[in-house]
Interface confidence: low
């Protein structure tokens, strides 16, 4: 239904608090370098304007689109050219090109300082002094570092952030109460950001058909009792929500997500028996809960898939009549029967089925041609099963840190041109698949592991896209969304790589390493490991292990020394010399 004023419509639907929070997120995701105070000023101006439109929808400029209003507001920033360079050229464009231009300048790896957590008392004082500013600052800092963060979900995180401070700043031991909660929010937030980044990449790089296929498979696994028409309706609505959020239309996205949650809860009898608890919660919690809800039980009496999709004489007729509907039904029927498969595997199977029908429906005897199509699925299913089995065995044998190191070596040898920080970040995240998924029984391992790996490899793809250095990464990232993981798995050592020159500075360490947290110390060691492999890509596992063991002993020894800095300087030289000898550098 058309509204005279879109901004008034969204203000009334969302309420002032959510409206302001979402506009702040939108602005911070576009202008990631702007100071907090500047954004707050812009948001207040937009909010005041929205209120005039609520009072009189016919008032001047109230009929303008949100992109026009927000874009005009962003283009008033005085330092746009100095701070953002060519992004300022966006302001010379008209909508919708201007918004597309802003979207293209979103930076997945902005040059922003690491967020340092102040002392608990300092944070509690700031929280009590001005709760609203404190929470806005949280939204701002997360949004500018994660320009594709799912905005309505960020509101949910902010609500939990507020609850943590409200509870813990009154506790006897504030730190014991607060710090674990903040750690949990940080880790969940990073995971949420990465998952949403994959959804946006899927929509933006591979189109809505790819996203819809993913959604059909996932929702069919989650709601196996729902009819195909019901799943289709949810897929259409979910696609709209994510297209809006990925496109920077955060007010529409949040509004439509709320409508979708409302619809799901009003129709839970025909969707899933697992939604009852979610639907009793307030809006933000409800939407989050629905998004994470466990798979419903499969109907007991599902017939064989072969009847409709292989044995029927009408397969080609049905396919020709409406290809995407028929393939959608195939994906729905296969996915609801296989909660034990990853979504990407289900999509590979659907792609194989589609390719077979394209070929066979043009053949002299179509039925004869596609009769064995399900046999082609076997190797596709076994490949991730075997890979997960092998890697879980390795993880159980090594533990997380050493498993990450094994992956660091593996991936550095595959794509040594990629920057060291990216290789460390991605390999550490790949390594977390072990503790995340290997504990699960067989039936849950593949959906956990392979769909998680898709999220992590997408991080590699978006970081690499910003500064492309490897044709192999580009190829694996762009050829097929569902075959990214098999593509990377299949890469061997890059024989064309010219080893990096040895630089002693890279392997010079100082006493400051002793005061780092265990995690940060690991990252330092893993950074050194990547650099070692870049210098000596042909080094064996045994050689690398020996050097890393020596390195760990060196750090431990010097951190216990009275004169730490001297120890690092002198012992460090010896370590570098010994490592060069061991690796033949």
């Amino acid at each position: 239904d058309a509204h005279k004023s879109e901004v008034a419509h969204r203000f009334k639907d969302l309420g002032e608090e959510n409206f302001k929070a979402l506009v702040l997120i939108a602005f911070a995701q576009y202008l990631q370098q702007c100071p907090f105070e500047d954004h707050v000023k812009l948001v207040n101006e937009v909010t005041e304007f929205a209120k005039t439109c609520v009072a009189d929808e016919s008032a001047e400029n109230c009929d303008k689109s949100l992109h026009t209003l927000f874009g005009d507001k962003l283009c008033t920033v005085a330092t746009l050219r100095e701070t953002y360079g060519e992004m300022a050229d966006c302001c010379a464009k008209q909508e919708p090109e201007r918004n597309e231009c802003f979207l293209q300048h979103k930076d997945d790896n902005p040059n922003l300082p690491r967020l340092v957590r102040p002392e608990v008392d300092v944070m509690c004082t700031a929280f009590h002094d001005n709760e609203e500013t404190f929470l806005k600052k949280y939204l701002y800092e997360i949004a500018r570092r994660h320009p594709y963060f799912y905005a309505p979900e960020l509101l949910f995180f902010a609500k939990r952030y507020k609850a943590a401070f409200t509870e813990c700043c009154q506790a006897a031991d504030k730190a014991a109460c607060l710090l674990p909660k903040l750690d949990e929010l940080r880790d969940e937030g990073k995971a949420s950001s990465a998952k949403q980044r994959l959804k946006c990449a899927s929509l933006q790089k591979f189109g809505e058909r790819a996203f819809k296929a993913w959604a059909v498979a996932r929702l069919s696994q989650r709601f196996p009792k729902a009819e195909f028409a019901e799943v289709s309706k949810l897929v259409t609505d979910l696609t709209k929500v994510h297209t809006e959020c990925c496109h920077g239309d955060l007010l529409e996205c949040a509004d439509d997500r709320a409508d979708l949650a409302k619809y799901i809860c009003e129709n839970q009898d025909s969707i899933s028996s697992k939604l009852k608890e979610c639907c009793e919660k307030p809006l933000l919690e409800k939407s989050h809960c629905i998004a994470e809800v466990e798979n419903d039980e499969m109907p007991a009496d599902l017939p064989s898939l072969a009847a409709d999709f292989v044995e029927s004489k009408d397969v080609c007729k049905n396919y020709a009549e409406a290809k995407d509907v028929f393939l959608g039904m195939f994906l729905y029927e296969y996915a609801r029967r296989h909660p034990d498969y990853s979504v990407v595997l289900l999509l590979r199977l659907a792609k194989t089925y589609e390719t077979t029908l394209e070929k066979c429906c043009a053949a002299a005897d179509p039925h004869e041609c596609y009769a064995k199509v399900f046999d082609e699925f076997k190797p596709l299913v076994e490949e991730p099963q075997n890979l997960i089995k092998q890697n879980c065995e390795l993880f159980e044998q090594l533990g997380e840190y050493k498993f990450q190191n094994a992956l660091l070596v593996r991936y550095t040898k595959k794509v040594p041109q990629v920057s060291t920080p990216t290789l460390v970040e991605v390999s550490r995240n790949l390594g977390k698949v072990g503790s995340k998924c290997c504990k699960h029984p067989e039936a849950k391992r593949m959906p956990c592991a392979e769909d998680y790996l898709s999220v992590v490899l997408n991080q590699l793809c978006v970081l690499h896209e910003k500064t492309p250095v490897s044709d192999r990464v580009t190829k694996c990232c762009t050829e097929s969304l569902v075959n990214r993981r098999p593509c990377f798995s299949a890469l061997e050592v890059d024989e064309t790589y010219v080893p990096k020159e040895f630089n002693a500075e890279t392997f010079t360490f100082h006493a400051d390493i002793c005061t780092l947290s265990e995690k940060e110390r690991q990252i330092k060691k893993q950074t050194a490991l990547v650099e070692l492999v870049k210098h000596k890509p042909k080094a064996t596992k045994e050689q690398l292990k020996a050097v890393m063991d020596d390195f760990a002993a060196f750090v431990e020894k010097c951190c216990k020394a009275d004169d730490k800095e001297t120890c690092f300087a002198e012992e460090g030289k010896k370590l570098v010399a010994a490592s060069q000898a061991a690796l033949g550098l």
């Epitope: 189109g207 809505e208 058909r209 819809k212 289709s232 309706k233 897929v235 259409t236 696609t239 709209k240 297209t243 409406a322 290809k323 995407d324 509907v325 959608g328």
Partner: nanobody
Framework: EVQLVESGGGLVQEGGSLRLACAAS????????LGWYRQGPGNERELVAT???????SYADSVKGRFTISRDYDKNTLYLQMNSLRPEDTGLYYC??????????WGQGTQVTVSS
């Protein structure tokens, strides 16, 4: 409810050109196939041209080489460029969008008249 609105029809001399446009009132997320159809005086409605979401096109034999179907995804608009028009091309031209998850949509039609 999404509406389709055709425009660009009119009266043209034989051998002339017209460009029809079909605009959707809002973004349609589940397009499967887009097409132009026509209904000449006293005739059944017939297919003129189709385009898939992957931009594969197909044409009725009678218009091959003369008509070109295209779409502008960002503007939610379907086009039909008609060159070398003939009197037998006269009729009411409709656009249709077949959808994956919803019933198909038809426009209300735009009249094309080719005089000899």
């Amino acid at each position: 409810e999404v509406q389709l609105v055709e425009s660009g029809g009119g009266l043209v001399q034989e051998g002339g050109s017209l460009r029809l446009a079909c605009a959707a009132s809002e973004r349609i997320w589940d397009i499967n196939l887009l097409g132009w159809y026509r209904q000449g005086p006293g005739n059944e409605r017939e297919l003129v041209a189709t385009i898939t979401v992957g931009d594969s096109t197909s044409y009725a034999d009678s218009v091959k080489g003369r008509f070109t179907i295209s779409r502008d995804y960002d503007k939610n608009t379907l086009y039909l460029q008609m060159n070398s028009l003939r009197p037998e091309d006269t009729g009411l031209y409709y656009c249709k969008i077949r959808r994956t998850w919803h019933s198909e949509l038809w426009g209300q039609g735009t009249q094309v008249t080719v005089s000899s």
